[in-house]
């Protein structure tokens, strides 16, 4: 059967400062059963964007309703965006474990440029 | 949806036992599973989930009871060894549906099979 | 492991009243909290998610509401087919799920 892949679209996405950036992200299967996560960079040093379970993440929204049945759609937007966020931006699928999950997979990134604001 | 158990009987303590549930009306293999139990009388206890590859169990019954599934026959399994006398219950088969970016919950059971563990 | 409580464990009303019951949880489950009926003889049937969306088909009748650790299943105007027991699931933190102890809704 098919492992479940996780589908970036984009390689990049450019955004003016300011405005909101939307990070497409889909799986390709519910199963195996698990969490996903939104990091910025990769390796030890990663910084989380977004994980729905626990964390408060003010400027980040989730594109499909957090009430959706058997949603695959993982995309996210991040409003006010500066400088400061551009980078590879990574969907990533856990796998289920006890007491910690386990990195299952990841999608190949999305690079995020922002723009000066228009003057 | 249709679910259906099957494999409940009488055991002998120390005895072995393979439920089959044999699932329908939906997309079996994109989904995971679950066995849920309970006892004469008694509340709801969870067994366990399958999702790919992926199984998880309750305390007390792991190490004996083994899950497993066949997509080509849109089958769910529980092997049950080393029965004991608390494990007599009604086991039901349970589809996962899941919300979003959160846990599983159970749309769909079965109407049971009973397993009765006596001497 | 996240323990379920619900109260009362038996609750007799007339046809035609007004149920109300409740789930505790032993810590924040957020939303992540299901209902389920089961009828005598039957299996169990899955009434709301998500703490409060009723399920395809549920009457409306039936209602959720709570989040974190509080919650409650009401049901207005209770119907025949209504007597049953009802069962809260949490699913933001597992393995184990975790079900409650059960609230047994009997005819007054």
């Known amino acids: 059967e098919d492992e479940l892949q996780v589908i970036q679209p984009e390689k990049s996405v450019s955004v003016a400062a300011g405005e909101s950036a939307t990070l497409r992200c889909a799986m390709t299967s519910l199963i195996p059963v698990g969490p996903i996560m939104w990091f910025r960079g990769a390796g030890a040093g990663r910084e989380l964007i977004y994980n729905q379970k626990e964390g408060h993440f003010p400027r980040v929204t989730t594109v499909s309703e957090l009430t959706k049945r058997n949603n695959l759609d993982f995309s996210i937007s991040i409003s006010n965006i500066t400088p400061a966020d551009a980078g590879t931006y990574y969907c990533v699928k856990f796998r289920k474990g006890s007491p910690d999950d386990v990195e299952f997979k990841s999608g190949a990134g999305t690079e995020l440029s922002v723009r000066a604001k228009p003057s | 949806v249709q679910l259906v158990e099957s494999g409940g009987g009488v055991v002998q303590p120390g005895g072995s036992l393979r439920l089959s549930c044999a699932a329908s009306?939906?997309?079996?293999?994109?989904?995971?599973m679950t066995w849920v139990r309970q006892a004469p009388g008694e509340g709801l206890e969870w067994v366990s989930t399958?999702?790919?590859?992926?199984?998880y169990y309750a305390d007390s019954v792991k190490g004996r009871f083994t899950i497993s599934r066949d997509n080509s026959k849109n089958t769910l399994y529980l092997q049950m060894n080393s029965l004991r006398a608390e494990d007599t219950a009604v086991y039901y088969c349970?589809?996962?549906?899941?919300?979003?970016?959160?846990?599983?919950?159970?749309?769909?059971w079965g109407l049971g099979t009973l397993v009765t563990v006596s001497s | 492991e996240i323990v379920l409580t619900q109260s009362p464990a038996t609750l007799s009303v007339s046809p035609g009243e007004r149920a109300t019951f409740s789930c505790r949880a032993s810590?924040?489950?957020?939303?992540?909290l299901a209902w389920y009926q089961q009828r005598p003889g039957q299996a169990p049937r899955l009434l709301i998610y998500?703490?409060?969306i009723r399920e395809t088909g549920i009457p409306e009748r039936f209602s959720g509401s709570g989040s974190g650790t509080e919650f409650t299943l009401t049901i207005t105007s209770l119907q025949s087919e209504d007597f049953a027991v009802y069962y809260c699931?949490?699913?933001?933190?597992?393995?184990?799920?975790?079900f409650g102890g059960g609230t047994k809704v009997e005819i007054k």
């Open positions: 699931q949490q699913y933001y933190d597992w393995p184990p799920f975790t």
């Open positions: 998500a703490a409060r």
């Open positions: 399958i999702g790919s590859g992926d199984t």
């Open positions: 009306g939906f997309s079996f293999s994109n989904f995971a």
């Open positions: 349970a589809k996962d549906s899941t919300v979003s970016w959160s846990g599983d919950f159970f749309d769909y």
């Open positions: 810590q924040n489950v957020k939303n992540d």
